[in-house]
């Protein structure tokens, strides 16, 4: 149950998809990946105020309890709701091969 | 790929399952739930240091980029990996009914 998409903190401050450019060195992949040399990494970043993009009932509970006990219960967190697949050309013991990764690039975000 | 379960921050400091007692009033459910009067809410709380319980490749990327750009990229976050179902006895327009919720109580945690 995706709840409100209106961010009360101001435009772009709440949980949403961001793109971060990263080299193989940045990612620690230089020793096993040949291509691409750079990745446009999509990830979920931003605040999760009350009921904003609440992923499920658990997220709603977390919001309620965070309001009551902020030192004990953290606010919901902005994480991927789904992923886009990506291919990497990688070195293996038997040579170079193409591998598809289904859990690498965030496609959509929610709060949980 | 669940990575290391050793917490470098000390026992109990890293991402794990916690139980928080909450009343219907705490949860904002008093007007539509009859039972239970109190819930032992299991939720995921704790830090996600490098590669601790990394849920997937995305979490590993996030760790690497957080180390490089801590002001831009947040550290991975402790969230449910799976849920335990729970039943609520709730008021409806037609009376009282039993409803099972599959996404209410965290069963297992990971970092993403």
């Amino acid at each position: 149950a995706r709840n409100g998409d209106h961010c009360p903190l101001g435009p772009g401050r709440c949980c949403r998809l961001h793109t971060v450019r990263a080299s193989l060195e940045d990612l620690g992949w230089a020793d096993w990946v040949l291509s691409p040399r750079e990745v446009q990494v999509t990830m979920c970043i931003g605040a999760c105020p009350s009921q904003f993009r609440a992923a499920n009932m658990h997220a709603q509970i977390k919001t309620s309890l965070h309001r009551l006990k902020p030192d004990t219960v953290p606010a919901p967190c902005c994480v991927p709701a789904s992923y886009n697949p990506m291919v990497l050309i990688q070195k293996t013991d038997t040579g170079v091969s193409l591998q598809t990764y289904d859990d690498l690039l965030a496609k959509d975000c929610h709060c949980i | 790929a669940r990575n290391g379960d050793h917490c470098p921050l000390g026992p109990g400091r890293c991402c794990r399952l916690h139980t928080v007692r909450a009343s219907l009033e705490d949860l904002g459910w008093a007007d539509w739930v009859l039972s239970p009067r109190e819930v032992q809410v299991t939720m995921c709380i704790g830090a996600c240091p490098s590669q601790f319980r990394a849920a997937n490749m995305h979490a590993q990327i996030k760790t690497s980029l957080h180390r490089l750009k801590p002001d831009t990229v947040p550290a991975p976050c402790c969230v449910p990996a799976s849920y335990n179902p729970m039943v609520l006895i709730q008021k409806t327009d037609t009376g009282v009914s039993l409803q099972t919720y599959d996404d209410l109580l965290a069963k297992d945690c990971h970092c993403i």
């Epitope: 886009n84 291919v87 193409l98 598809t100 | -």
Partner: antibody
Amino acid sequence: QITLKESGPTLVKPTQTLTLTCTFSGFSLSTYGIGVGWIRQPPGKALEWLAHIWWNDNKYYNTALKSRLTITKDTSKNQVVLTMTNMDPVDTATYYCARLAYDYVDSWGQGTLVTVSS
Amino acid sequence: DIVMTQTPLSLSVTPGQPASISCKSSKSLLHSEGITYLYWYLQKPGQSPQLLIYQMSNLVSGVPDRFSGSGSGTDFTLKISRVEAEDVGVYYCAQNLELPPTFGQGTKLEIK
């Protein structure tokens, strides 16, 4: 298993437009890093790169042929279409489509021979 | 466009003997990040080309290790340590440093 298959006319007349379709399976053109390219090989000659299209709809056309070429994709149908206008007998060749992953060209169709003749 | 020139254009080798094919590019294929964008393909009779060597020296997974690639910025060599009957066909070098990717004219390998 990855397969690509080219389809289209085997004979076209000079000045006509050639439309070739590459139908593929075993991969998705919505995957980051994936593309489909068209390459041709005139009888007894070297391979020549014509055009390619990426997952994000970025396209490349060989400069020498750019004005004659159009490449499009239909991700839901797993198809890439190449059109080439104003065909000439020198365009007689075997036309291949191939899967690309960045600079890694690992899977090719079997090719289709197109003859341009009146 | 970058011009790729192969020698010899044909080659007849006794099974079990080595074979070597040369390829020269009209411009250095060594990129500033240390990668050489040179590739070797084999087109067996009646078949489509298949990738053998990736980025000058990386053997593609599934390709027998009797094949090897080497070279510098503009001069490249494909070696077959012991030719087998299944190695017959036309070998192409190609560059992907600049668009369009360009191919050599091919070297036909026959068995004596």
